[in-house]
């Protein structure tokens, strides 16, 4: 039959961060290979990762076509060394993935503080706008471009000499906070989509950045910048 002794895939799981999206499954293949298909609810199936011995398939190129669509994938199992034959009528065993809506479900990647600059008793903190693989008119879009106002950032800041944290929020990638003159502060940011009600509502916190701890900081302005 051409599908003898093949085992259907199971535990199909979407792993997605900032729209980079990979479908994973089990088991590790023994004498079998896999092909993945993906479609929207109303669309046609498109095959990816043909006859692969891997247990993952990068579907980013497909889901970024419309991140607000809902996608379904399925994984077919074939005997190792399988060559597609026109005469084969028996459908190989397959398993469906859970539905996946990238806009609602992709995890927010760990943000990065791009720069901070102190002028007097104010500090301007800028969050780096991460690029995604989502395109519009052949241009890659940033996380802000895709999510717009659905994405906010929370800034946590505290005096280097104490542990009491303060917070600020912004609908942009910029903060402007009041600080005490002569004090050094530390900063960390977190990306948040408030409209989400699930575990993927928040990113992990960014690495902590502190005033006065880095090379390249100007004593006059307290300017500090990362180049990526």
């Amino acid at each position: 039959s051409g599908t003898t002794n093949t085992v259907a895939a199971y535990n199909l799981t979407w792993k997605s961060t900032n729209f980079k999206t990979i479908l994973e499954w089990e088991p590790k293949p023994i004498n079998q290979v896999y092909t993945v298909q993906i479609s929207t609810k109303s669309g046609d199936w498109k095959s990816k990762c043909f006859y692969t011995a891997d247990t993952e398939c990068d579907l980013t190129d497909e889901i970024v076509k419309d991140v607000k669509q809902t996608y379904l994938a399925r994984v077919f199992s074939y005997p190792a060394g399988h060559v597609e034959s026109t005469g084969s009528t028996e459908e190989p065993p397959y398993e469906n993935s859970p539905e996946f809506t990238p806009y609602l479900e992709t995890n927010l990647g760990q943000p990065t503080i791009q720069s901070f600059e102190q002028v007097g008793t104010k500090v301007n903190v800028t969050v780096q706008d991460e690029w995604t693989l989502v395109r519009r008119n052949d241009t890659f879009l940033s996380l802000r471009d895709v999510f717009g106002k659905d994405l906010i950032y929370t800034l946590y800041y505290w005096k280097s000499s104490s542990s009491g944290k303060k917070t600020a929020k912004t609908n942009t990638n910029e903060f402007l906070i009041d600080v005490d003159k002569g004090e050094n502060y530390c900063f960390s940011v977190q990306a948040v989509i408030p409209s989400r009600r699930t575990a993927n509502r928040k990113s992990t916190d960014s690495p902590v950045e502190c005033m006065g701890h880095e090379k390249g900081e100007s004593r006059e302005t307290g300017h500090h910048h990362h180049h990526h």
Partner: antibody
Framework: QVQLQESGPGLVKPSQTLSLTCTVS?????????WSWIRQHPGKGLEWIGE???????RYNPSLKSRVTISVDTSKNQFSLKLSSVTAADTAVYYC??????????????????WGKGTTVTVSS | EIVLTQSPGTLSLSPGERATLSCRAS???????LAWYQQKPGQAPRLLIY???SRATGIPDRFSGSGSGTDFTLTISRLEPEDFAVYYC?????????FGGGTKVEIK
């Protein structure tokens, strides 16, 4: 100084699609603001229809979402509203507005600070 | 959706008097997302107050905003003839963004 001007037909037949364009002058549509449509039924309050970012990211009022499309044309410095399957209940003054960031409480938040003059759209056969 | 209820519906006052307008939300609104607009007949709304208590550029200091949570207030300390208009509160923290029904401040 940014100015907005709505344009489009003042009369639309029931079941047809209402199409309006807002032209932005005195500034770039790609400069980090959002662009909104709001309407006001005769003698009534204001109803938010939706908004768009220059990147094409949109938010819509769920009550109108199935009928509304907002799009942006950065090359013409314009954004547009399409409202399908209109009825007499869609008769209103339609405003376009800029949603610009203002500093508040350590961060920046968006408020509709520049509005067009509004255009009256009547739905009637 | 968040419903904003404004009261009173109409406020009849004389120039020089103090006007106090109320806006009550059906659920808590982050102050950062609360604004007040003024609209005169035949004109588009004009932003007066943002962040519940900050005056927009060019707005006279007789206008002030206050409040948090579900209760917000717009106060006009001394009414000038040009202040007679309809005032709307608005929230844009939660989709759909919503406006209150408006309070008309008219000359007594």
């Amino acid at each position: 100084q940014v100015q907005l001007q709505e344009s489009g037909p003042g009369l639309v037949k029931p079941s047809q699609t209402l199409s309006l364009t807002c032209t932005v002058s005195g500034g770039s549509i790609s400069s980090g603001q959002y662009w909104s449509w709001i309407r006001q039924h005769p003698g009534k309050g204001l109803e938010w229809i939706g908004e768009i970012y220059y990147s094409g990211s949109t938010r819509y009022n769920p009550s109108l979402k199935s009928r509304v499309t907002i799009s942006v044309d950065t090359s013409k410095n314009q954004f547009s509203l399409k409202l399908s399957s209109v009825t007499a209940a869609d008769t209103a003054v339609y405003y376009c507005a800029r949603d610009a960031p203002y500093y508040y409480g350590g961060g920046y938040y968006y408020y509709m600070d520049v509005w067009g003059k509004g255009t009256t759209v009547t739905v009637s056969s | 959706e968040i419903v904003l209820t404004q009261s009173p519906g109409t406020l009849s006052l004389s120039p020089g008097e103090r006007a106090t307008l109320s806006c009550r939300a059906s659920e808590s609104v982050d102050s950062s997302y609360l604004a007040w607009y003024q609209q005169k007949p035949g004109q588009a709304p004009r932003l007066l107050i943002y962040g519940a208590d900050s005056r927009a550029t060019g707005i006279p200091d007789r206008f002030s905003g206050s409040g948090s949570g579900t209760d917000f207030t717009l106060t006009i300390s001394r009414l000038e003839p040009e202040d007679f208009a309809v005032y709307y509160c608005q929230q844009d923290g939660v989709v759909p963004y919503t406006f209150g029904g408006g309070t008309k401040v008219e000359i007594k």
